[in-house]
């Protein structure tokens, strides 16, 4: 029961996380015009991964797509790639995990197969979450660098009449959505990996036993009947996948590589 709950919860948490990653990727507010300590303008600028927008004081908003690929900063391209990889992995993970859910019966699928699928989807969710967190963190790091560079530019060379005031950008809502969504996907993936350990069938080495029924003998060999038939393996299940434990260890060490901000 606990295994089913853990698996189900992991699936739901990952589903919410991936929906969040998709939402963040599509959002226009990755960076927003910094209004603090800035000359107040009657227009508000904000930018996403795919287009930049300008909102006038009347509420009129105009967005323009980035119609160039080669002209865009490499970092922006990298963030796009990370987010898309995260979405694709997450989507595949969701598809796999649907079939892996203990509460769903598909033909005579074995518990070992479900365990494998749960582990696979869990790893996919973890990588998906890490991709999203990495993408958002890279973008945030880019923003922080540009913010301080433009701040330095604002306060230099002010001897004469200032001709231009540089627009500074700060963190937009999409960054926070991305971080939270990535974290949820990662947590969901970890939960799926934990659930996988409980799902895995116990390999019990039974001695071959001969049963004498109505005068003729039938030999039952180990592994002859699978878990799906209701015989053989104990459905309480003990841990047999050390791989699951290893994945959790990886989860703890891996994010630090992407700890940019």
């Amino acid at each position: 029961m606990a295994v089913t709950a853990c698996q189900g919860l992991g699936f739901v948490v990952s589903l919410i996380g991936i929906a969040g990653i998709i939402a963040a990727t599509c959002m226009d507010q990755w960076s927003t015009q910094d209004l603090y300590n800035n000359p107040v303008t009657a227009v508000f600028n904000y930018q996403g991964l795919w287009r930049s927008c300008v909102r006038e004081s009347s509420g009129f908003t105009e967005c323009r797509g980035y119609f160039t690929l080669l002209g865009l900063p490499a970092m922006l391209q990298a963030v796009r790639a990370l987010m898309i990889v995260g979405i694709v992995l997450g989507a595949i993970g969701l598809l796999v995990s649907i079939f892996a859910l203990k509460c769903i019966r598909i033909g005579s699928m074995e518990d070992s197969a479900k365990a494998n699928m749960t582990l696979t989807s869990g790893i996919m969710f973890i990588v998906s979450g890490l991709c999203a967190i990495a993408g958002v963190s890279v973008f945030a790091n880019m923003l922080v660098t540009n913010f301080w560079m433009s701040t330095a530019n604002m306060y230099t060379g002010m001897g004469g009449m200032v001709q231009t005031v540089q627009t500074r950008y700060t963190f937009g809502a999409a960054l926070f959505v991305g971080w939270v969504a990535g974290g949820l996907t990662l947590i969901g993936g970890v939960m799926m990996c934990i659930a996988c350990r409980g799902l895995a069938p116990e390999e019990t080495n039974y001695k071959a036993v001969s049963y004498h029924a109505s005068g003729h003998s039938v030999a039952y060999k180990p592994g002859g009947f699978k878990a799906s038939t209701g015989f053989g393996s104990n459905t309480k299940n003990k841990k047999i996948y050390d791989g699951g434990a290893r994945t959790e260890d990886e989860v703890q060490s891996y994010p630090s590589k992407h700890d940019y901000v």
Epitope: Q33, P39, V40, T41, A42, V43, N45, Q47, S52, C53, V54, E56, S57, S58, G59, F60, E62, R64, V162, Q163, T164, V165, T167
Partner: antibody
Framework: QVQLVQSGAEVKKPGASVKVSCKAS????????IHWVRQAPGQGLEWMGR????????YYNEKFTGRVTMTRDTSTSTVYMELSSLRSEDTAVYYC?????????????WGQGTTVTVSS | DIVMTQSPDSLAVSLGERATMNCKSS????????????LTWYQQKPGQPPKLLFY???TRESGVPDRFSGSGSGTDFTLTISSLQAEDVAVYHC?????????FGGGTKLEIK
């Protein structure tokens, strides 16, 4: 058609207050900012501030902060501009103007103007 | 505050001739986000309120004759009347529509020579 009709001319003594009204018609009153701009005799235009009738949010030119108050009455589609502690240099024609939607923050319709004379 | 400087203060042009007036802002009115200049031109005839002519420096308001044209970017802007008509006699104001507080130029008075 869009119309902004302002109240009549006023003559005030220094130190007094004046309240000018601007009645809007021909459009959804709560959806557009209303600005107040004044023009002293023979001078240029001077922006005083604006109010969003939908929420009552205001934004004033710092020069007038503390002296100007902009309010609205949605039931009558009317915006009011009150200027207190009047001085002789406040003698001007006061205009209300609607900010156009998608027109680069510009004012596309103007009231006929209200002449305010501050004289002792 | 942004200072808007209009030149000349007054301009006398013969009917049918070209009239050109300038407006200079102390800071750039170009918004990098949409590459638009937040400068507005108004026409004010004697005893009347101002009338919107151009926004975004060069976008003509509906109903404005095409003999009027607006140009310029950043800090320098121009309003041109290709062939002056008698009804064009007015004061022309430019306005900073980018920074608060909005500021106007002193105006250019256009007369017939």
């Amino acid at each position: 058609q869009v119309q902004l009709v302002q109240s009549g001319a006023e003559v005030k003594k220094p130190g007094a207050s004046v309240k000018v009204s601007c009645k809007a018609s021909g459009y959804i009153f709560t959806n557009y900012w209303i600005h107040w701009v004044r023009q002293a005799p023979g001078q240029g235009l001077e922006w005083m501030g604006r109010i969003y009738p939908g929420t009552g949010n205001t934004y004033y030119n710092e020069k007038f902060t503390g002296r100007v108050t902009m309010t609205r009455d949605t039931s009558t589609s009317t915006v009011y501009m009150e200027l207190s502690s009047l001085r002789s240099e406040d003698t001007a024609v006061y205009y209300c103007a609607r900010e156009g939607y998608g027109k680069g923050n510009s004012m596309d319709y103007w009231g006929q103007g209200t002449t305010v004379t501050v004289s002792s | 505050d942004i200072v808007m400087t209009q030149s000349p203060d007054s301009l006398a042009v013969s009917l049918g001739e070209r009239a050109t007036m300038n407006c200079k802002s102390s800071q750039s009115l170009l918004n990098a986000g949409n590459q638009k200049n937040y400068l507005t031109w108004y026409q004010q005839k004697p005893g009347q309120p101002p009338k919107l002519l151009f926004y975004w420096a060069s976008t003509r308001e509906s109903g404005v004759p095409d003999r009027f044209s607006g140009s310029g970017s950043g800090t320098d802007f121009t309003l041109t009347i290709s062939s002056l008509q008698a009804e064009d006699v007015a004061v022309y104001h430019c306005q900073n529509a980018y920074y608060y507080p909005y500021t106007f130029g002193g105006g250019t008075k256009l007369e017939i020579k």
